[in-house]
Interface confidence: low
């Protein structure tokens, strides 16, 4: 189970993980105390037949080719959490592990 | 964490799970002994802003809008295995649980 890593200069058109830093202040998300910025990464690229397909199911649907099936798309296949300090809806300060905030690997599904 | 279920008569354009029966014999996959057919299901539809987004990360990438990010796509968010009887590469008969063969839920990621 592997995935490609790229950057903005890459010539890779296939499904790949790209670096992306999310800046909460730039979004106006002032309820987040820390971190103000973090490395989130994102997935982009084309999913050609069988390339980086995570599940056998993806291949089977391609074979069966039902109406409306758009083919696999490039999406996170492994994600990890980050620890965050933030205000909840009751203005209480919460420290917690927020799941699925960082993309570790991209694939076609 | 929920997802929409549709069928071929549905007018739903958003991300939805559709029924699909995979027929191994029709594919010529003669190394699969059983089942010959199974209900695999598949995901199809549009991912509008925030609709059925599985991860907060998806929303953040949409906000940051990096080059080449295509927006979320409709993809399996919950899958389950099936038990299969099949020949392996050495012509041995294997009975095993094959992961991620059935789509239980679809979402935008």
């Amino acid at each position: 189970d592997f995935g490609l890593d790229c950057d903005e200069h890459s010539t890779e058109s296939r499904c790949c993980r790209y670096p992306l830093t999310v800046d909460f202040e730039a979004f106006g998300w002032d309820w987040i105390i820390a971190p103000k910025r973090y490395k989130a990464n994102y997935c982009s690229g084309e999913c050609e037949f069988v390339f980086l397909q995570k599940y056998p199911h993806t291949h089977l649907v391609h074979q069966a080719n039902p109406r409306g099936s758009a083919g696999p798309c490039c999406t996170p296949t492994k994600m990890s959490p980050i620890n965050m300090l933030y205000f909840n809806g009751k203005e209480q300060i919460i420290y917690g592990k927020i799941p699925a905030m960082v993309v570790d690997r991209c694939g076609c599904s | 964490d929920f997802g929409l279920d549709c069928d071929e008569h549905s007018t739903e354009s958003r991300c939805c799970r559709y029924p699909l029966t995979v027929d191994f014999e029709a594919f010529g996959w003669d190394w699969i002994i059983a089942p010959k057919r199974y209900k695999a299901n598949y995901c199809s539809g549009e991912c509008e802003f925030v609709f059925l987004q599985k991860y907060p990360h998806t929303h953040l990438v949409h906000q940051a809008n990096p080059r080449g990010s295509a927006g979320p796509c409709c993809t399996p968010t919950k899958m389950s295995p099936i038990n299969m009887l099949y020949f392996n590469g050495k012509e041995q008969i294997i009975y095993g649980k094959i992961p991620a063969m059935v789509v239980d839920r679809c979402g935008c990621s």
Partner: antibody, heavy 119, light 107 residues
Framework: EVQLVESGGGLVKPGGSLRLSCAAS????????MNWVRQAPGKGLEWVSS????????YYADSVKGRFTISRDNAKNSLYLQMNSLRAEDTAVYYC????????????WGQGTLVTVSS | DMQMTQSPSSLSASVGDRVTITCRAS??????LGWYQQKPGKAPKRLIY???SLQSGVPSRFSGSGSGTEFTLTISSLQPEDSATYYC?????????FGGGTKVEIK
């Protein structure tokens, strides 16, 4: 057998337009990025433009940006290069070449079509 | 933009000679480099991909090496049919860039 056949070249006046085509056969065209490369008479090879398999990613050399447009029709197994505001320095043999990352990078080329820009 | 400096621009060698052509990238490009042979009036033909992998059907006297910024194409024993112009191509970043070419002549 993989085949790429360019057409559409010819003589055109400066400032004129031309549309090149590349007909592909013998492989799954829709799975490959495609490229145009040119070669001026007696000179070296120059990459012109690339288009990814489903047209999501398009790149141009600075020398043609804003004047040339690359496109493809996967249903017709065809690649195109629309060339506008042609200049004398665009005179070259234009080749199409297929590409799918390192292993398939420019592994097959067409025979080329000559574009001459002259008054 | 990435610059690819190829040397020499031309060379003349005898049949059986070992010939070496080099390509230098202005920045590191891992092994994202190919070598191409072009004969007059013909389309280029790929010899090497991934800096060192031999294209199927290409004679084993051709070999490629290098990584990062320095790359070499070697013809271990020059043959008459090797008379051609050779180009390197980097595909690490856009714009894709070719080296200036090396014209190989047989003495």
């Amino acid at each position: 057998e993989v085949q790429l056949v360019e057409s559409g070249g010819g003589l055109v006046k400066p400032g004129g337009s031309l549309r090149l085509s590349c007909a592909a056969s013998g492989f799954t065209f829709s799975s490959y990025s495609m490229n145009w490369v040119r070669q001026a008479p007696g000179k070296g090879l120059e990459w012109v433009s690339s288009i990814s398999s489903s047209s999501s990613y398009i790149y141009y050399a600075d020398s043609v940006k804003g004047r040339f447009t690359i496109s493809r029709d996967n249903a017709k197994n065809s690649l195109y290069l629309q060339m506008n505001s042609l200049r004398a320095e665009d005179t070259a043999v234009y080749y199409c070449a297929r590409d799918r990352g390192s292993y398939f990078l420019f592994d097959y080329w067409g025979q080329g079509t000559l574009v001459t820009v002259s008054s | 933009d990435m610059q690819m400096t190829q040397s020499p621009s031309s060379l003349s060698a005898s049949v059986g000679d070992r010939v070496t052509i080099t390509c230098r990238a202005s920045q590191g490009i891992r092994n994202d480099l190919g070598w191409y042979q072009q004969k007059p009036g013909k389309a280029p033909k790929r010899l090497i991909y991934g800096a060192s992998s031999l294209q199927s059907g290409v004679p084993s006297r051709f070999s490629g090496s290098g990584s990062g910024t320095e790359f070499t194409l070697t013809i271990s024993s020059l043959q008459p049919e090797d008379s051609a112009t050779y180009y390197c191509l980097q595909h690490n970043s856009y714009p894709l860039t070719f080296g200036g070419g090396t014209k190989v002549e047989i003495k």
